[in-house]
């Protein structure tokens, strides 16, 4: 059937709660493509009816919520003008018992995000909530060892928990909780995070790999909106920063007044041996001065750029 088969290296382990997976495969999904989800090699696509417990929402597959029987291999087929890619995603569902007193303690943490705080520094934890636009997430609450986190050293800022002057006592089992609303129904999302403390600061010795961009040019029409992802793989324990710069200045600072070009919020997916980070740059309106300028994605010591260029004139139109 002429598709390139691509398999995820890890199993995604999820609890009986809302779960979503986005079928993106950079840089394949950067052009015009169609995405269709299937389960267990079925020829029948996953429903697109939003009332269905499992349905496709744009490029996402959405489970509201996930159940035991949902374990299996899901395929998303990405069809482009001259290519087809079939991504195989293995989902395994298991029951989480967070702070159920009858169970006692926390669940098996095999699927938890592992995050690091740096001793003596001001640092942060991130609550990874990846859902399509149709899902509205309420404010996030943070817990440590089943107790809600309070205190002046801790500040909740959007999806992050800011921790000032990190101490050794900050290691342990954390959870972030949010209420997700979809089509008028509410669901609870609870993500666990195992936190360790390190004294190592700054550049962690790993060299991040920038998957995309690849030091290339992008043809884009004047006046259009453009979003470009920077996709980076790095070790799980890395302390590298990822950002977009232009003229050696952070884009958010460079375009501070007009806010015409902005850096997006970083997201990441956790894999067996590494993390895949994505941070995008958004051009609200491409202007003439943007052409020929290298927009640099930085990840630790690694860099890669894109250069915008005007499309070649299409003489067939004349």
């Amino acid at each position: 059937d002429g598709c390139k088969d691509i398999f995820m290296k890890n199993e995604i382990l999820s609890a009986s709660q809302p779960f979503a997976f986005n079928c993106t495969f950079p840089p394949i999904t950067s052009g015009e493509v169609s995405v269709t989800w299937y389960k267990n090699s079925s020829k029948i696509p996953v429903s697109k009816i939003i009332q269905s417990r499992i349905h496709q929402d744009e490029t996402w597959i959405l489970f509201l919520p996930m159940e035991w029987g949902d374990s299996g291999v899901y395929q998303c087929v990405i069809k482009g003008r001259d290519s087809c890619h079939r991504i195989h995603v293995n989902l395994t569902v298991f029951e989480k018992h967070w702070c159920d007193t009858s169970i006692g303690g926390l669940p098996n943490l095999s699927d938890e995000y592992k995050q690091i705080l740096h001793l003596g520094k001001d640092d942060s934890l991130t609550c990874h909530l990846h859902f399509p636009k149709s899902c509205v997430l309420g404010p996030i609450k943070w817990y440590k060892d089943c107790n809600e986190i309070k205190g002046e050293r801790f500040t909740v800022l959007e999806t992050r928990l800011l921790v000032s002057n990190v101490s050794a006592e900050d290691r342990g089992n954390y959870a972030c909780q949010a209420i997700l609303t979809h089509s008028g129904k509410q669901y609870e999302v609870l993500n666990g995070i195992t936190v360790s403390i390190t004294e190592r600061a700054g550049y962690g010795g790993s060299v991040p790999k920038i998957i995309y961009p690849k030091n290339h040019s992008i043809e884009v029409q004047l006046g259009t909106t453009l979003i470009v992802d920077c996709n980076v793989t790095d070790t799980k324990d890395n302390t590298n920063l990822r950002c977009w710069r232009v003229n050696n200045t952070l884009v958010d600072d460079y375009y501070d007044e007009s806010k015409r070009i902005r850096e997006g919020v970083e997201t990441h997916v956790s894999f067996r041996e590494h993390n895949l980070y994505t941070v995008n740059i958004t051009f609200l309106e491409v202007k003439m001065e943007d052409y020929g300028l290298p927009f640099m994605c930085h990840a630790g010591v690694s860099t890669a750029y894109i250069i915008l260029q005007l499309p070649a004139p299409d003489f067939r139109a004349y």
Epitope: D5, I6, F25, G80, T233
Partner: antibody
Framework: QVQLVESGGGVVQPGKSLRLSCAAS????????IHWVRQAPGKGLEWVAI????????HYADSVKGRFTISRDNSKNTLYLQMNNLRAEDTAVYYC???????????????????WGQGTTVTVSS | DIQMTQSPSSLSASVGDRVTITCRAS??????LNWYQQKPGKAPKLLIY???SLQSGVPSRFSGSGSGTDFTLTISSLQPEDFATYYC??????????FGQGTRLEIK
């Protein structure tokens, strides 16, 4: 440095068996799919088989299916090719080669080969 | 299976020449095309992957282009060490991985 070293080649009679080995060093062996590729004297390259990074799947060229078995021992950083019922047309230099790590966090049934061994010669003759 | 056809089968050129080798797939393979160089008695060496990406350590005089069914390997200015056999290989529809029959580049 990143290296693959084949061994186990030799002269063998038709119908007999031979086992090739490929020792890897300088990279995390268990993260990569590995291929066997062969080249008959004076001929082009022919892909033989691939084994995925964790040994969970193997794929073979039609010409060797049912006769050759690819396997790996990640604890020993070693790849194997068990060749049974050998034929004269199996005479070739056999190379092991590392699959391109084109997609971090994902794997495929083979993308290309970025690191090659020096080759080991198998001659099938009566 | 996808067939890969290279042309020409052999080619004579001089140092400093610009050389082009083409590879055609029997069906669209998107950009899943790799190029290798092989010298007598040696293992092949990856030059270009994903149709146009230069493998680390390969001189910039080598370049690749194409998408779909038609692909090109170009050597902008031939050096003495470039005389070898070149193979294309598809990895779109696998298994099996398939190679072209090779192009032998000789000194004129």
């Amino acid at each position: 440095q990143v290296q693959l070293v084949e061994s186990g080649g030799g002269v063998v009679q038709p119908g007999k068996s031979l086992r090739l080995s490929c020792a890897a060093s300088g990279f995390t062996f268990s993260n990569y799919g590995i291929h066997w590729v062969r080249q008959a004297p004076g001929k082009g390259l022919e892909w033989v088989a691939i084994i995925l990074y964790d040994g969970s799947n193997q794929h073979y060229a039609d010409s060797v299916k049912g006769r050759f078995t690819i396997s790996r021992d990640n604890s020993k950083n070693t790849l194997y090719l068990q060749m049974n019922n050998l034929r004269a047309e199996d005479t070739a230099v056999y190379y092991c080669a590392r699959d391109l790590d084109l997609w971090s966090g994902y794997y495929t049934n083979g993308d290309g080969m970025d690191v090659w061994g020096q080759g080991t010669t198998v001659t099938v003759s009566s | 299976d996808i067939q890969m056809t290279q042309s020409p089968s052999s080619l004579s050129a001089s140092v400093g020449d610009r050389v082009t080798i083409t590879c055609r797939a029997s069906q669209s393979i998107s950009s899943y095309l790799n190029w290798y160089q092989q010298k007598p008695g040696k293992a092949p060496k990856l030059l270009i992957y994903a149709a146009s990406s230069l493998q680390s350590g390969v001189p910039s005089r080598f370049s690749g282009s194409g998408s779909g069914t038609d692909f090109t390997l170009t050597i902008s200015s031939l050096q003495p060490e470039d005389f070898a056999t070149y193979y294309c290989q598809q990895s779109y529809s696998t298994p099996p991985i398939t190679f072209g029959q090779g192009t032998r580049l000789e000194i004129k």
